[in-house]
């Protein structure tokens, strides 16, 4: 599933869409003096049956309050390059962040972008010559549009539409772990971890100091970046005198397994290299940092283990919500499973099913999780992020339930409220056995496929699987078509 393009050649701006109808950035009115009014999470529990009419009322209220809004409607997040220019992208240009403030809210969402990594001089040189925006700020556009969880539209982001939104571009190629500057010896700087710290420092002067909750989120390499940095952000805020800001994490598509590849391949470039090999090499090349408590669990030289979610998660102090497709495309890529439209071999098919099982196993003790049985990669800044459900619950709803679990105590309560779950892991065994998975299209005709068509297209043998499951082939086909 391709994301929308948010950059263009050599700094060109993409054509801007027409402005949406007037809708304020927040529904609360700014008080005259003193503290801003805190915004509350919208509690959907009472309106479960009639969400459309509820959203219509919210929109109508918002429209009527629009004239009260001092600020012009602007969906864009604006670029701020770091004032501390010693904290840099790979090429020595200053790192930065995109910000859209929401002055009535004490919630801050900091999103870490993803984009793989490079782990030696050769593949970093090649990355610099083909994906420079991931290594330099020189051509970054002045604004970005917030999508998915970064959207300020309640329809697109029922979870935190009113929060202060921060998008931190990934330009360190180090899975947000590095702390080494560019030097005579090092052609590239790897300062991912320091970039996050510096962004937080600078945001304190822009209103973050009054925050109640800071949610550090990220997708793909950014999701792994969340696991690696969330505790450090909390420590930094404590050190700087802000212990009351609750720091939480939201890791999307960054929970990888250090499993055996389907077919062993030499570690030549990022996408062929086995997960453990890539991170082992990378951590040395980047002078990568891992969370202190995790580092203590592994001996020197074994810190690479902390890049893998199931190993680092138990050592984290901050609450983290894990979002992970059970059949993640990036995981399959590094595992050398390439689904290119030809039917998969039986060995591949079993490997894929086993991957789903293994991943499900690693999420068993994760308190807050959302893991649909889909073949995809990244979700939280996709505009369709509200559409996918696990056991009847959408991701924004699960995040809302997770939020509510903190209202009583600082630590997430172990048991979710009745009817408000936030440990949601699909149990069906195949890719796209969940009917709400993102649309799959036939790669050649562009036609949408239902799950039965998709599985057959992948070489799924209904007879054999029905036999394995001890049921009639027709019954299995029916189940697949209904997505059970």
């Amino acid at each position: 599933s391709e994301g929308r393009k948010t950059w263009r050649r050599r700094g060109q701006q993409p054509p801007q869409p027409p402005p949406p109808p007037p809708l304020p950035q927040r529904a609360e009115v700014e008080p005259g003096a003193g503290q801003p009014v805190e915004s509350f999470p919208l509690d959907f529990t009472a309106v479960e049956g009639n969400m459309d009419s509820f959203m219509a009322q919210v929109k109508s209220l918002a429209q009527s309050l629009y004239p009260c809004s001092a600020q012009q409607l602007n969906e864009d997040l604006r670029l701020h390059l770091l004032l501390n220019t010693s904290v840099t992208c790979n090429d020595g240009s200053p790192a930065g962040y995109y910000l859209k403030e929401s002055k009535g809210s004490r919630r801050w969402l900091l999103f870490l972008e993803g984009g793989w990594y490079c782990f030696n001089r050769e593949n970093c040189d090649s990355r610099y010559d083909t994906m420079r925006r991931l290594m330099s700020s020189k051509d970054w556009p002045h604004t970005r549009t917030g999508t998915g969880i970064l959207s300020s539209q309640p329809e697109e982001n029922p979870h935190w539409w009113n929060a202060n939104m921060v998008f931190i571009p990934y330009c360190s190629s180090d899975v947000w772990s590095g702390a080494s500057p560019k030097s005579d010896k090092n052609e590239y700087a790897f300062m991912g971890s320091l970039i996050i710290q510096e962004v937080v420092r600078e945001l304190l002067g822009k209103g973050l100091s009054g925050a109640k909750v800071l949610l550090l989120a990220g997708s793909s390499a950014g999701g792994t970046g969340v696991l690696l940095n969330v505790d450090r952000v909390a420590e930094l805020l404590e050190e700087l005198g802000y212990p009351s800001i609750q720091v939480r994490g939201l890791a999307d598509s960054g929970w990888f397994l250090d499993n055996k590849q389907y077919r062993r391949s030499d570690c030549i470039d990022t996408i062929n290299c086995a997960p453990t090999d890539a991170i082992r090499r990378g951590i040395r090349y980047w002078s990568g940092m891992v969370p202190e408590r995790c580092q203590r669990q592994f001996k020197e030289g074994e810190e690479w283990n902390c890049f893998f979610g199931y190993k680092v998660y138990p050592t984290l102090r901050c609450p983290v919500f894990v979002v992970q497709w059970l059949f993640d495309e990036a995981q399959l890529t590094v595992d050398n499973v390439h689904l290119t439209g030809q039917p998969v071999q039986e060995g591949q098919w079993l490997y894929i099913q086993n991957l789903g099982r293994e991943l499900r196993g690693t999420l068993k003790d994760v308190q807050a999780s959302f893991a649909p049985a889909c073949l995809s990669h990244e979700i939280i800044i996709r505009s369709y992020w509200t559409d996918v459900q696990v056991k009847g619950t959408s991701l924004p709803r699960a995040l809302h339930c997770w939020d509510r679990s903190f209202h009583d105590s600082h630590k997430a309560s172990k048991t979710p409220m009745k009817g408000c779950p936030f440990h949601l892991v699909d149990s069906c065994p195949w890719p796209h056995c969940n009917p709400s998975c993102p649309t799959i299209r036939d790669q050649f005709t562009g036609q949408e496929m239902n799950v039965a068509q998709f599985l057959m297209h992948m070489g799924f043998d209904v007879q054999t699987v029905a036999q394995q499951q001890g049921m009639e082939p027709s019954k299995l086909l029916g189940m697949l078509s209904n997505g059970n």
Epitope: E2, G3, R4, K5, T6, W7, R8, R9, R10, G114, G115, W116, R121, E122, D125, S126, Y128, D129, T130, M131, R132, R133, L134, D139, E187, S220, D269, T270, I271, N272, E329, T333, H338, L339, T340
Partner: antibody, heavy 119, light 111 residues
Framework: DVQLLESGGGLVQPGGSRKLSCAAS????????MHWVRQAPEKGLEWVAY????????YYADTVKGRLTLSRDNSKNTLFLEMTSLRSEDTAMYYC????????????WGQGTSLTVSS | DIVLTQSPASLAVSLGQRATISCRAS??????????IHWYQQKPGQPPKLLIY???DLESGVPARFSGSGSGAAFTLNIHPVEEEDAATYYC?????????FGSGTKLEIK
């Protein structure tokens, strides 16, 4: 105006050597990765080699590995391709191409220089 | 190495009709929301010319009748309506990882 101009082609005997050059103008040469692409008579395009913008990394197609040496002089805005142990199958039009740094696509090509390996 | 399979090898299309050329990669060339597939046009005696980059973006100066689509491992170049001057050979190319490779080419003839 962005321009690439190849030179150095001609007739060479099998086993012989040749050095091709590509002179760049109209852009900051040291900002771009550069590539050589060749095309045998009546055949398709074949990617041959890459030099990173700083010149520190070079990468070759398996078909030419060990026989080609790619280098660049950023102060003179020139890319070089030194070819040794030439074979008849190296007969082709050799193009120098600039790779865009926001996708790696070749947004500028030279006119090419023709190399014939024959006795 | 990523192998690009282009089809058909040649096609003849009537003036004003649609030409569709397919390019299939041996593994995904998409990452982080971008697809590293590009399309070139080459006429006899000339170097190739960039038409489409990153699967669907039109190079400036290229007529809007050229369009590209696809993601993952399957991509398409469409020309509609075909004009006389579009008679040429078309190549797809990936830049997802080194070594870069090209498709074998599709020769378009105008009927």
């Amino acid at each position: 105006d962005v321009q690439l101009l190849e030179s150095g082609g001609g007739l060479v005997q099998p086993g012989g050597s040749r050095k091709l050059s590509c002179a760049a103008s109209g852009f900051t040469f040291s900002d771009f990765g550069m590539h050589w692409v060749r095309q045998a008579p009546e055949k398709g395009l074949e990617w041959v080699a890459y030099s990173s913008s700083g010149g520190t990394t070079v990468y070759y197609a398996d078909t030419v590995k060990g026989r080609l040496t790619l280098s660049r002089d950023n102060s003179k805005n020139t890319l070089f391709l030194e070819m040794t142990s030439l074979r008849s199958e190296d007969t082709a039009m050799y193009y120098c191409a600039r790779a865009s740094y926001d996708g790696g696509y070749f947004d500028c090509w030279g006119q090419g220089t023709s190399l014939t390996v024959s006795s | 190495d990523i192998v690009l399979t282009q089809s058909p090898a040649s096609l003849a299309v009537s003036l004003g009709q649609r030409a569709t050329i397919s390019c299939r990669a041996s593994k995904s060339v998409s990452t982080s929301g971008y697809s590293y597939i590009h399309w070139y046009q080459q006429k006899p005696g000339q170097p190739p010319k960039l038409l489409i980059y990153l699967a669907s973006d039109l190079e400036s100066g290229v007529p809007a009748r050229f369009s590209g689509s696809g993601s993952g491992a399957a991509f398409t170049l469409n020309i509609h309506p075909v004009e006389e001057e579009d008679a040429a050979t078309y190549y797809c190319h990936h830049s997802r990882e080194l070594p870069f490779t090209f498709g074998s080419g599709t020769k378009l003839e105008i009927k």
